[in-house]
């Protein structure tokens, strides 16, 4: 599997209607909770608690504050935390309760603290909970927490230091935890939990079971340095400890290897930054998505990996365990045990089949069932992904969130979209189209270019967005800019699922607002712009140069997987002299503007799709030059390299009209300028001209030229 | 109370087979493993083979692939082994037991086999 | 093969003498499926520790168990007259299980 390509479109902060949500003085808005049903997203930032509407996340609805004491802020300091960042209350805890109250837990001046949000009165009920093994004391560790029927499930750590890790049951009437050993949890760097229901119609009686995602340091592998390993863990929901082996500690926590790496290279992908659980009316089983970078990772890469939650289930279910078996210098070796395992099979949920055993609850399990579990957490078999190969994996790029909607396209193919966030602030939206990877936007939702610390998704029908959370504010986007595309080759190139063109209205919609039925409307995911109806040609704008002056002909072509080339009179314009210049990859410039630079400009796309070459006029500049007695100077148009385009600045190119498709671009100097030979000078004249340039307007303004089936390139 | 009987002894001819068995009670065959394990007149003990009866999962030490045999019938809880061409280096006697993580809990009383011409 | 040693081979003691058989696996064993065994003559073996140091259901706490990785002992703290007979360790770590090749503990 190869890199995926670059976004093909790069939208910048403010090119985009993207809505956002800051208050002053408040940093960290780390923790999202949505209530779809009462169009509220609520926030835990920094000692403060919001809700929003989340149609609408600038409209504040109300907030909470929750600010450490002077005191507490002291003593704090004088266990040598900084008093204006680690001795604060960051809300790392923020999940539902009841109807009318969510459970709320910070770190406050590392003595975590929970409490109940009332959300009628939207005060805290001032219950001032212990919140040790429910949130981190110190702001910079990893944490994660999921509420399952009113009790809250955590992995964090246990101790001011940070050294004690972990996952734990919050209830009143069985609280259990993870044996504090190596083998159990090893320096472990938290992610993501979450509760996966029994089906309703499972037949054996199962239980439910909550899944952890963390990276820890491993105990199988050995080198020289600390290798991480990504872990799926899982704990039944059923589970009550045990009696005398394991009481008050889970019976049932068995974890796994995660495996995500690249089968023809050494590529292992090993450090996991987020997953998100993928439910779908039409999947039988939940997919998660995974996404990580590698432990070592001078270049900036990331990838995705996606795993069927059956196969996770199966290696808990009919594995093989580890065992560890200590070498010279009570070193610890772990090896794969092949021999029998006790029954009931150890961190096995309690079923009907375990029912008839007379095993009604892990209570009653036997002592070697327990022990060997204690014994032996970790299993061998690992985790392996779906196509056994990463759905994405991206140079030059860290990813730090995921959410994956799952969406129908107009053919009635499924896709999985891919929405990542990057420690720059950016989102990429991706989707896989037959085994290759095509990034359909990224979108700039930071200006401050700052990491985005939480993605969420909504998945009510209709408006839906996602939402973004950095050290600065949240910020809430559409899932797809349709309207931007305002053509429909522009339209149909965007492979966008979301996205179809509507000949009557002659825009591009986003299917799931269209409330009338999806006939007529055009959407080839192959990318197919032949299907496009013709368009009728644009209007024509003047502009007025000086003689002897510059003229910027406008080439708007958003596309970064396109290589812009110009035409003049149908002639090749050709690369060596400093008549001709490029800005910002795509417009003209024309120096020193005189009478034989009249005639007909036009700027062309080449983009690939597939195993074809898309050919489209995207602009039509016509260039009269007229005497008149007093020049007026043509304002000067800045054009700013787009951030994220990643693609060098291309040399002009040009081909006769309808002629074979032009020779490819000759990369352009370090300057970003191009040029082209001299034409011949044209019979000079005492009076200086009036330039008249009759433009198109930057939209494709013909039909795709030619749709070509092209050689491998 | 556990107990594992295991059948009286056989005095078989070489080449030969034999198939010997270890009724339980106190306790259901599909809940454990269960082995067999030899021992030669003043010699030490060799495993021989576990089942898992609930499945019929089978494990042998591979000097005995071929050799031995293991079944289980669930109906009767009771446990098989069956030794095939028998020679005078399978005369021993031969223990039926159950365990796993706590060890090799409950043990049979033994069937002593001889082969002899 | 695990091949586990044990040593000595033969002992003779007396009553209220402290006895230690040594179990040496040619590899590294876990320490959770290493068991000993008394066997008397003409009877079936008997399980004494179970899982290096665990005492097994009904056996005396003159018993005791110890060890890790390749090396690991069974002692009797005071010696009786009852425990005259060969003791074994096993392995159950690594396929095929595999037994010691057993020590021959007699009345001084």
């Known amino acids: 599997m190869a890199f995926a390509p670059i976004p093909r479109i790069t939208w910048e902060h403010r090119e985009v209607h993207l809505v956002q949500f800051h208050e002053p003085d408040i940093y960290n808005y780390s923790a999202l909770l949505l209530s779809e049903d009462k169009d509220t997203l609520y926030i835990g930032a920094r000692e403060a608690v919001f809700a929003v509407n989340a149609l609408n996340i600038s409209e504040k609805q109300h907030e909470v504050y929750w600010k450490v004491s002077e005191d507490k802020k002291a003593k704090c300091a004088e266990k040598g935390k900084s008093k204006q960042t680690e001795c604060l209350n960051y809300i790392r805890v923020l999940q539902p309760l009841s109807a009318t109250s969510l459970y709320v837990c910070g770190t406050n001046a590392f003595q975590p603290a929970c409490d109940h949000l009332n959300l009628t009165s939207f005060k805290f009920l001032g219950k001032n909970e212990d919140g040790k093994g429910r949130c981190p004391f110190d702001p910079a560790h990893s944490y994660t927490s999921v509420m399952v029927d009113g009790e809250l499930y955590s992995g964090t750590s246990y101790n001011f230091l940070g050294s004690e890790p972990i996952i734990s049951r919050n209830s009143s009437h069985s609280p259990l935890r993870t044996e504090y050993a190596i083998p159990w949890l090893n320096e472990p760097s938290f992610v993501f939990a979450d509760v996966i229901r029994k089906s309703p119609d499972s037949p054996d009686g199962e239980d439910d079971r909550v899944y952890f995602f963390f990276t820890e340091v491993s105990v199988e592998y050995e080198f020289v340095f600390r290798v991480l390993i990504p872990r799926i863990a899982r704990v039944c929901k059923g589970d009550q400890g045990g009696l005398r082996t394991l009481q008050k500690k889970w019976t049932s926590f068995l974890k796994a290897r995660l495996i995500c790496s690249r089968p023809d290279s050494g590529l292992v992908f090993n450090v996991l930054r987020d997953v998100f659980v993928l439910r779908s009316p039409g999947l039988k089983v939940p997919v998660f998505y995974a996404l990580f970078t590698p432990q070592l990772n001078n270049v900036g890469l990331s990838a995705v990996c996606a795993y069927n939650l059956s196969t996770a289930e199966e290696v808990f279910s009919h594995g093989k365990y580890m065992q560890s078996t200590t070498v010279e210098q009570s070193h610890t070796k772990w090896v794969r045990y092949n021999g029998p395992v006790p029954k009931p099979r150890p961190g096995a949920c309690i079923d009907s089949e375990a029912r008839a055993a007379n095993y009604t609850s892990s209570l009653n399990l036997p002592d070697k069932t327990l022990q060997f579990v204690k014994d032996h957490p970790l299993m061998d078999d690992s985790v392996t992904p779906i196509d056994n190969r990463p759905r994405l994996i991206k140079k030059d790029v860290n990813y730090t969130q995921i959410v994956v909607d799952r969406t129908q396209a107009l053919d009635g193919t499924v896709y999985d979209v891919m929405f990542v966030s990057t420690d720059r602030g950016a989102l990429h939206k991706a989707i896989s189209l037959e085994h290759a990877v095509h990034i359909i936007e990224e979108t700039q939702l930071f200006q401050d270019f700052e990491p985005v610390q939480t993605l969420l998704l909504s998945s009510k029908k209709g408006n839906r967005f996602v939402y973004a959370g950095s050290n600065s504010g949240v910020v809430q986007a559409p899932l797809a800019f349709c309207g931007k595309h305002g053509t429909c080759e522009d339209c149909v190139l965007a492979r966008d699922p979301y996205c179809a063109w509507s000949p009557p209205t002659a825009t591009c919609v986003a299917l799931h607002q269209t409330e009338s039925p999806s006939r007529g409307l055009i959407q080839e995911m192959s990318g197919d712009a032949s299907v496009c109806p013709d368009k009728s040609k644009g209007s024509y704008r003047q502009h007025f140069f000086k003689h002897g002056g510059t003229a910027e002909l406008k080439c708007s072509q958003k596309s970064n997987l396109a290589r812009v080339f110009w035409k003049f009179q149908n002639g090749v314009l050709k690369a060596e002299s400093p008549k001709y210049g490029l800005m910002g990859r795509k417009n003209l410039l024309i120096f020193n503007l005189s009478e034989g630079d009249s005639g007909v400009y036009q700027c062309l796309s080449e983009e690939r799709v597939k195993n074809k070459t898309v050919f489209q006029v995207v602009a039509k500049h016509v260039l009269e030059v007229k005497v008149v007695p007093k020049p007026v100077v043509a304002p000067t148009l800045s054009v700013v390299q787009t951030e994220g385009s990643r693609i060098a600045t291309k040399v002009l190119v040009a081909s006769t009209q309808g002629s074979s498709p032009p020779t490819p671009a000759v990369q352009a100097t370090s300057s970003g300028a191009i040029t082209l030979p001299p034409k011949p000078a044209p019979t000079g004249t005492s009076c200086e001209p009036k330039i008249v340039i009759n433009t198109v307007p930057q939209l494709h303004s013909e039909k795709t030229m030619y749709l070509k089936s092209s050689d491998n390139r | 109370e556990v107990q594992l009987q295991q059948s009286g002894a056989e005095l078989v001819r070489p080449g030969a087979s034999v198939k010997l068995s270890c009724t339980t009670s106190?306790?259901?065959?599909?809940?454990?493993?269960m082995y067999w394990v030899k021992q030669r007149p003043e010699q030490g003990l060799e495993w021989i083979a576990w089942?898992?009866?609930?499945?019929?999962?089978?494990e042998y030490a591979s000097k005995f692939q071929g050799k031995a045999t293991i079944t289980a019938d669930t109906s009767s809880n009771t446990v098989y082994l069956q030794l095939s061409n028998l020679t005078s280096e399978d005369t021993a006697v031969y223990f039926c037991?159950?365990?796993?993580?706590?060890?090799?809990?409950?043990w049979g009383q033994g069937t002593l086999v001889t082969v002899s011409a | 093969e695990i091949v586990l040693t044990q040593s000595p081979t033969t002992m003779a003691a007396s009553p209220g003498e402290k006895i230690t058989i040594t179990c040496s696996a040619s590899s590294s064993i876990s320490s959770n499926f290493l068991h000993w065994f008394q066997q008397k003559p003409r009877f079936s073996p008997k399980l004494l520790i179970y899982?290096?140091?665990n005492l097994a259901s009904g056996v005396p706490a003159r018993f005791s168990g110890s060890g890790s990785g390749t090396s690991y002992s069974l002692t009797i703290g005071t010696m009786e007259a009852e425990d005259v007979a060969t003791y074994y360790c096993q392995q159950g770590s690594f396929m095929p299980f595999t037994f010691g090749t057993g020590t021959k503990l007699e009345l001084k």
């Open positions: 106190g306790f259901n065959i599909k809940d454990e493993h």
């Open positions: 899982r290096t140091s």
């Open positions: 037991t159950t365990g796993d993580y706590d060890g090799f809990t409950y």
């Open positions: 089942i898992d009866p609930e499945n019929d999962n089978t």
